[in-house]
Interface confidence: low
């Protein structure tokens, strides 16, 4: 570690007295203090001497001696004290600057060790200082104002008290900055547009930022728009805002607006598009498929999604038939806006009765007229069955009735005994029908198939059954021949006629 | 059938305001889309477009000389007018009004034009 | 403002031989989201308002003969008179109207050759 000569911690002396600094180390040393006129700086070898023979109170200060060549990287100092009547303050900076809750040292330096009692922080032309400023004083380097304040911007000057009057330093201008937590917070609005040609249109686009210094423009397809910035402070931010107007907009005014802010911190962007369209426009459409096919007592929800311009004037659900003048009730309608041009509503149907199928139609409204969207709802039913003896042309025949949607499948099975229902290890015979015949095929009902089973003599030991079935489920109808007839019944556990 | 007629005076001298008429039938202006349109010809020269109004009372200018037009729309008449003040001898022309059908901007039948001369 | 630039200024075709009249326009007058140019080719004769031939670029007029068709997309459009005829002597512009000021191209003189 180098040593100074004297070696003392502090030095004080008189204006125009003579001072010597010696620095003696094991290899080369330099000396570090603040810059100040006067000094003469005289090396040899491993010693350096700094010297003046008219010291000033602006050679006050402290003066450091390092070792490069040290890799404990020692230094020692001393201070220096030019006591000057007339000048109590040695100040080695005239504007400081530091980021908001960091300390900002004011490093006016007292050139009388003696004053210290007496030193004080004021404000320019004397004013005090701002309530809540926190700060600390040392004489080797000045007053220390801790966790600095943007508001605390303000011109400072010290104060010694010098034979009972209070001597100002020239002033220290401290510019505290507003911490930036990164670029300016963006907003355009809107966040999409649409117009007709000729229609007036506004988008704005508005950065702000703790810190004035801040750039902010609005630019169309890569084009920056020259627009008159408005500018506000309020909530502790600074606010710039461009304003587009567009008195009758065409379509070179379509396309891609981006709001751009820049600060030191980088940079913010935000786009949105414009739209302008010859006439006002309706579009419905569904993600849904329009023809629907739902099982009986299942709910569904119709959706339709509305793409207008402009908004809506009108909307409805209406129910077209074929069961009943019904209508959709309100309160199983519902509407959801995905945003300002688009929008989805929704008609709810708990519970379809078999009444309620059939076609319903969305219809919407707005300047460019009148839109509809029908969806065909069908609804699904298990089969229904039926068996009747009949004789067709002198034949004795089985007759079997299904209805049910989708058109169910017929199959005949033989079995020995009488049963509700023929099981595996009694069925003799199994007949399918691939083409029964269709009695029924009215839109959104069932549909109602027939298949006929021609028997020369019935076996009066065995069944008789018909099954139907379809993607909803299966029903069946057992016919037992007995001696005074015949007999026929449908199973115990019979699918339910909705 | 459409047919459009400009009427107005054929001298005008300078610093003094133009208004022409345009009276027309075969159409209604408050048929939705319907527009009608004003077009100058200098002798000799190209055509110029000037303004147009639409059936709902959009109108649109020629920017170059927006400051000096007007233009209206008396849909019971069936008639426009078209207003130009600060008449100059470079605005010596045919002045045509024309049909543009539904919101096109185009301009599909034309009246026969009438030839306004500024000259002191 | 779009320009609109027609050329050549004038033409000489002799009769029964195509003529062709070129347009061009400073920006696109296509308009993507219908696929629609908004262009439009007038024939004015001596002493006569302008009469239109065919608007959206390529659709004819009513009443206007098949002889005259017009072709092209964006910034490049053509009028093409297939077989001229003494009476197509005029003078043809071309039109914008996708964004105001609509204008006109300064014209084409056609004449007999």
């Known amino acids: 570690i180098p040593v100074i000569e004297p070696s003392v911690p502090e030095l004080v002396v008189k204006p125009g007295a003579t001072v010597t600094l010696r620095c003696v180390g094991n290899g080369s040393v330099e000396w570090d203090g603040p810059p100040s006129p006067h000094w003469t700086l005289y090396s040899d070898g491993s010693s350096s001497i700094l010297s003046t023979n008219n010291a000033t109170f602006q050679n006050t200060g402290t003066y450091r001696c390092t070792e490069p060549g040290d890799p404990l990287g020692g230094s020692a100092a001393i201070h220096l004290y030019v006591k000057d009547p007339a000048r109590p303050w040695n100040v080695l900076a005239q504007e400081v600057v530091v980021f908001e809750d960091q300390d900002a040292l004011l490093p006016c330096l007292l050139t009388d060790p003696v004053l210290e009692a007496g030193v004080s922080l004021v404000r320019v032309r004397g004013r005090p200082l701002m309530r809540h400023t926190n700060y600390s004083f040392s004489p080797w380097h000045g007053f220390t104002i801790h966790r600095a304040k943007f508001i605390q911007s303000q011109d400072y000057q010290c104060s010694a008290l010098m034979g009972g009057r209070k001597v100002m330093s020239i002033s220290i201008r401290l510019k505290v900055q507003k911490v930036i937590p990164g670029p300016p917070a963006l907003t355009l609005v809107p966040a999409e547009l649409v117009r007709i040609r000729g229609e007036a249109a506004q988008i704005v686009c508005s950065a702000s930022s703790v810190d004035v210094n801040f750039d902010v423009f609005l630019q169309h397809n890569n084009t920056k728009l020259a627009i008159p910035q408005q500018s506000d402070f309020h909530n502790n931010r600074y606010q710039k805002v461009l304003t587009l107007n567009l008195d009758q907009v065409d379509f070179q005014h379509a396309g891609n607006y981006s709001c751009v802010a820049s600060n030191v911190q980088g940079k913010h962007s935000t786009s949105m598009f414009f739209r302008v369209v010859e006439s006002a426009y309706l579009n419905l459409s569904s993600e849904q498929n329009l023809i629907q096919e739902v099982t009986v007592g299942e709910g569904l929800n119709l959706k339709v999604m509305v793409e207008a311009y402009p908004g809506l004037q009108g909307f409805n659900w209406t129910y077209l038939g074929p069961f009943s003048d019904h209508q959709p009730e309100p309160k199983l309608a519902n509407a959801t806006t995905k945003d300002t041009y688009r929008h989805t509503f929704t008609l709810s149907l708990p519970r379809l009765k078999p009444s309620e199928a059939g076609r319903y139609s969305f219809l919407a409204r707005n300047p460019g007229g009148w839109r509809a969207l029908t969806f065909e709802l069908t609804l699904r039913y298990p089969p229904e069955v039926s068996v009747i003896w009949t004789f067709i042309n002198g034949s004795g025949t089985l007759l079997c009735a299904a209805s049910g949607y989708p058109q169910p499948n017929v199959t005949w099975l033989q079995c020995s005994g009488h049963t509700d229902r023929c099981d595996e290890a009694q069925v003799l015979q199994v007949w399918d029908d691939p083409y029964p015949e269709v009695l029924s095929q009215e839109p959104f009902h069932k549909v109602t198939v027939q298949s006929l089973l021609t028997v020369e003599t019935l076996e009066h030991n065995q069944t008789y059954e018909c099954r139907a079935h379809n993607s909803v489920g299966s029903g069946s109808w057992a016919f037992i021949p007995i001696s005074a007839g015949a007999h026929t019944h449908p199973p115990d556990e019979f699918l339910f006629t909705p | 059938q459409i047919t459009l007629k400009e009427s107005g005076p054929p001298l005008v001298k300078p610093t003094q305001t133009l208004t022409l008429t345009c009276t027309f039938s075969g159409f209604s202006l408050s048929t939705s889309g319907v527009g009608v349109g004003w077009i100058r010809q200098p002798p000799g020269k190209a055509l110029e477009w000037l303004a147009l109004i639409y059936w709902n009372d959009d109108k649109r200018y020629s920017p170059s000389l927006k400051s000096r037009l007007t233009i209206t729309k008396d849909t019971s008449k069936n008639q426009v007018v078209l207003t130009m003040t600060n008449m100059d001898p470079v605005d010596t022309a045919t002045y045509y009004c024309?049909?543009?059908?539904?919101?096109?901007?185009?301009?599909?039948?034309w009246g026969q034009g009438t030839l306004v001369t500024v000259s002191s | 403002d779009i320009v609109m630039t027609q050329s050549p200024d004038s033409l000489a075709v002799s009769l029964g031989e195509r003529a062709t009249i070129n347009c061009k326009s400073s920006q696109s007058v296509l308009y993507s989201s219908n696929n629609k140019n908004y262009l439009a080719w007038y024939q004015q004769k001596p002493g006569q308002p302008p009469k239109v031939l065919i608007y959206?670029?390529?659709i004819r007029e009513s009443g206007v003969s098949d002889r005259f068709s017009g072709s092209g997309s964006g910034t490049d459009f053509t009028l093409t008179i297939s077989s001229l005829q003494a009476e197509d002597v005029a003078v043809y512009y071309c039109q914008q109207y996708y964004s105001t000021p609509y204008t006109f191209g300064q014209g084409t003189k056609l004449e007999i050759k």
């Open positions: 024309a049909h543009s059908p539904r919101y096109s901007g185009y301009f599909d039948y």
């Open positions: 959206w670029a390529s």
